[in-house]
Interface confidence: low
Amino acid sequence: QVQLQESGPGLVKPSETLSLTCTVSGDSISDYYWSWIRQPPGKGLEWIGYFFYSGGSNYNPSLKSRVTMSVDTSKNQFSLKLGSVTAADTAVYYCARSQLRYYLDVWGQGTTVTVSS
Amino acid sequence: EIVLTQSPGTLSLSPGERATLSCRASQSVDSNYLAWYQQKPGQAPRVVIYGASNRATGIPDRFSGSGSGTEFTLTISRLDPEDFAVYYCQQYGSFFGQGTRLEIK
């Protein structure tokens, strides 16, 4: 059974870059789309973007200028970088898998990131 | 690796009868990735059911799929002469069952 595990620093300073990694176990990164979603405290879900392991990607326009996603197939990991963070980027960040741009069928457990000096 | 075992190997029935084909997995399978295919002589297989229970486009509603975990079933409620073929179950991106031949009695 496929499992996703997010990892990264829990605290990031304003204006710095947030870096998160999602490790996939129980399945190959190939043939799926991989997404990042976040959820600010007490709020709803916001889709950050997805990429296909072969190199295709699509990001939420509201975050596009600050987002980079990449994959390391040798480690079965994919990552998120979010630049120039502010307090508004404080959230629980989830990685998730989908079938060819479709519904998010498997999610990581989420990792909390606080942006504060 | 997951092994899919289909039974019976051959099923002999008459048109109008109900056919029940079984597919058993050696370990639990996510039914979202369990498909059934129909293959007629000289033709490529075509998908009948995907996600264990969803009929593929153009498949008549006499075909239905069910099951979860390790036990899956393909049912044809009233056999039409054109339904006589070999049926395979498969976990996507992985192995197929060995097939069930549905023949006219």
């Epitope: 879900l45 997805y50 392991y53 072969s54 060819l100 | 498909a35 998908v47 996507y92």
Partner: antibody
């Protein structure tokens, strides 16, 4: 309309190698992985492996490692499978297949290529 | 962007009760809508995809319906463990967007 057009039947001698082609049309070739499936003498289907045409990363059923090599030519939207050191056990019909959009099954199949290995 | 609106932030019902959560898309999304359940401290879990298909292992007391712009998620008989927030999401066009969520409370 999605179509997968495979090369014609082949009669080859034991020990030889040969290559089957699968020309894709009706969709963006690099958007979907291409799968290959073996069917021996009208019997069971076996998944051989898949290749992602975008970055040419392939994944194989362990059983076919060393037997099959998957490649693509993006310029002609064609996938290839080379079968190595053929024996009578390799006599079969070989299919290329692609899954449907957002679904977990092979929705599109080539017509099949019959390979006969005989002295 | 397509806006997904869940008009009720909260819904309250008794165990065994029937309740429906609605979701409205700002434009036609055909049937490209998924529903997720999120329990406190947990990540979302897929329940329904393509508007009406139950995902693997989801109990049949959960059903989804709708097409175009209006979608409904229905509990035929609410159980205590259904206490959660429910989100709709469109997977019709980029960027994918979610509804604001509806919290199901048990009386």
């Amino acid at each position: 309309e999605v179509q997968l057009q495979q090369s014609g039947p082949e009669l080859v001698k034991p020990g030889a190698s040969m290559k089957i082609s699968c020309k894709a049309s009706g969709y963006s070739f690099t958007d979907y992985t291409m799968n290959w499936v073996k069917q021996s003498h009208g019997k069971n289907l076996e998944w051989i492996g898949l290749i992602n045409p975008y970055n040419v990363i392939s994944s194989y059923n362990q059983k076919f490692k060393g037997k099959a090599t998957l490649t693509v030519d993006k310029s002609s939207s064609t996938a290839y499978m080379e079968l190595l050191s053929l024996t009578s056990e390799d006599s079969a019909v070989y299919y290329c297949a692609r899954k449907g959009y957002g679904s977990s099954m092979f929705a599109y199949w080539g017509q099949g290529t019959l390979v006969t290995v005989s002295a | 962007d397509i806006v997904m609106t869940q008009s009720h932030k909260f819904m309250s019902t008794s165990v065994g009760g029937r309740v429906s959560i609605t979701c409205k898309a700002s434009q036609d999304v055909t049937t490209a809508v998924a529903w997720y359940q999120q329990k406190p401290g947990q990540s979302p879990k897929l329940l329904i995809y393509s508007a009406s298909y139950r995902y693997t292992g989801v109990p049949d007391r959960f059903t989804g319906s709708g097409s175009g712009t209006d979608f409904t998620f229905t509990f035929s008989s609410v159980q205590a463990e259904d206490l959660a927030v429910y989100y709709c999401q469109q997977h019709y066009s980029i960027p994918w967007t979610f509804g604001g969520g509806t919290k199901l409370e048990i009386k």
